[in-house]
């Protein structure tokens, strides 16, 4: 039975040209995390594999940095980066957990971070 929950940074906003940390956290389970995929709609940004390290998609290699931890840092933000991001946790023995983050990239200099929230 899958007992875990994914906690994410929720709905967040950031300034154009700036950077943002996409972060998810898996709690309430003793399952072992074997891999985390970071995806934007149907595009792969990066994979963090517990054995192998990081695979950064070449399309994003100049703008994506691994970490902190299992998170992902998105740099040189553009308005086109606005949208949904997913952290997909592959775990043993539970299976797959998915978290969602919505990022809004703003033209203005006022960009406030949304509250953290949980996805069961």
């Amino acid at each position: 039975m899958m007992t875990g929950t994914i906690e994410t940074t929720g709905n967040i906003s950031a300034e154009k040209g700036g950077s943002i940390i996409l972060q998810c956290h898996l709690s309430s389970t003793t399952a072992q995390v074997t891999q985390v995929n970071w995806e934007q709609q149907d595009q792969l940004l990066a994979i963090c594999n517990a054995d192998l390290g990081w695979h950064i998609s070449p399309s994003f290699k100049d703008r994506v940095a691994p970490g902190p931890g299992l998170g992902l840092t998105l740099q040189s933000l553009t308005v086109n980066d606005t949208g949904e991001y997913f952290c997909i946790y592959h775990t043993y023995p539970d299976g797959t957990y998915t978290g969602r983050i919505f990022l809004e990239v703003l033209e203005s200099s006022v960009a406030e971070h949304g509250a953290r929230f949980q996805i069961p």
């Epitope: 995929n37 192998l52 990081w54 070449p58 592959h90």
Partner: antibody, heavy 127, light 112 residues
Framework: QVQLQESGPGLVNPSQTLSLTCIVS??????????WSWIRQHPGKGLEWIGY???????YYNPSLKSRVIISVDTTKNQFSLKLSSMTAADTAVYYC???????????????????WGQGPTVTVSS | EIVLTQTPLSLSVTPGQPASISCKSS???????????LSWYLQKPGLPPQVLIY???NRFSGVPDRFSGSGSGTDFTLKISRVEAEDVGVYYC?????????FGGGTKVEIK
């Protein structure tokens, strides 16, 4: 010499789920140097990559099929499997399993070519 | 996804003559680690594909030295220096630098 052998039905009813298994012999699926893939080939057409699994369970699926695909691994049986749901006539194809090499360096990893392939059963979707 | 375009679609070659197949990528396959993950496969009639070349120019174990690969960026080439009867089949290029893995449409090689 590593060999791959697919097993599963040759005929699937429309709307049903295809289940295929790839048995690995002559080597361990637990080797960290490889990823394990499924590829299909429609009659008289080119090759379409379905997705991969690593021995510890990490996967990535082709976005074009991801809503219908599950790839799993059973290290105790030295095999990995494909499930493709909601089958239609457009899913009629030869389904291959294959082994690919992983290059890992300095905290990063990369996917190299597919060096061992199964024989590939033809799967027909028809009632 | 990265689209690979192969030319020509088919090729009819006299035994002993050279052959060349082109594979062009929709975006640069610039390596992240000083390697470019572009490989070549031959699918003989009724059989699964078999790897010939990996990482652009490295011949796989047991592949005859008449096969060679070259290229960088978006343009890659497979050359057969002297075609033999056993070389007939469909040749595919494949990129694995970016997921999903993608294949070229294939080039059918026949003997005249």
């Amino acid at each position: 010499q590593v060999q791959l052998q697919e097993s599963g039905p040759g005929l699937v009813n429309p709307s049903q789920t295809l289940s295929l298994t790839c048995i690995v012999s002559g080597g361990s699926i637990r080797s960290g140097d490889y990823y394990w893939s499924w590829i299909r080939q429609h009659p008289g057409k080119g090759l379409e990559w379905i997705g991969y699994i690593y021995y510890s369970g990490g996967t990535y699926y082709n976005p074009s099929l991801k809503s219908r695909v599950i790839i799993s691994v059973d290290t105790t049986k030295n095999q990995f499997s494909l499930k493709l749901s909601s089958m239609t006539a457009a899913d009629t194809a030869v389904y291959y399993c294959a082994r690919g090499s992983i290059a890992a360096r300095s905290g990063y990893f990369y996917f190299s070519g597919l060096d061992v392939w199964g024989q590939g059963p033809t799967v027909t979707v028809s009632s | 996804e990265i689209v690979l375009t192969q030319t020509p679609l088919s090729l009819s070659v006299t035994p002993g003559q050279p052959a060349s197949i082109s594979c062009k990528s929709s975006q640069s396959l610039l390596p992240s680690d000083a390697k470019t993950y572009l490989s070549w496969y031959l699918q003989k009639p009724g059989l699964p594909p078999q790897v010939l070349i990996y990482e652009v120019s490295n011949r796989f174990s047991g592949v005859p030295d008449r096969f060679s690969g070259s290229g960088s960026g978006t343009d890659f080439t497979l050359k057969i220096s002297r075609v033999e009867a056993e070389d007939v089949g469909v040749y595919y290029c494949m990129q694995s630098i970016q997921l999903p893995l993608t294949f070229g449409g294939g080039t059918k090689v026949e003997i005249k």
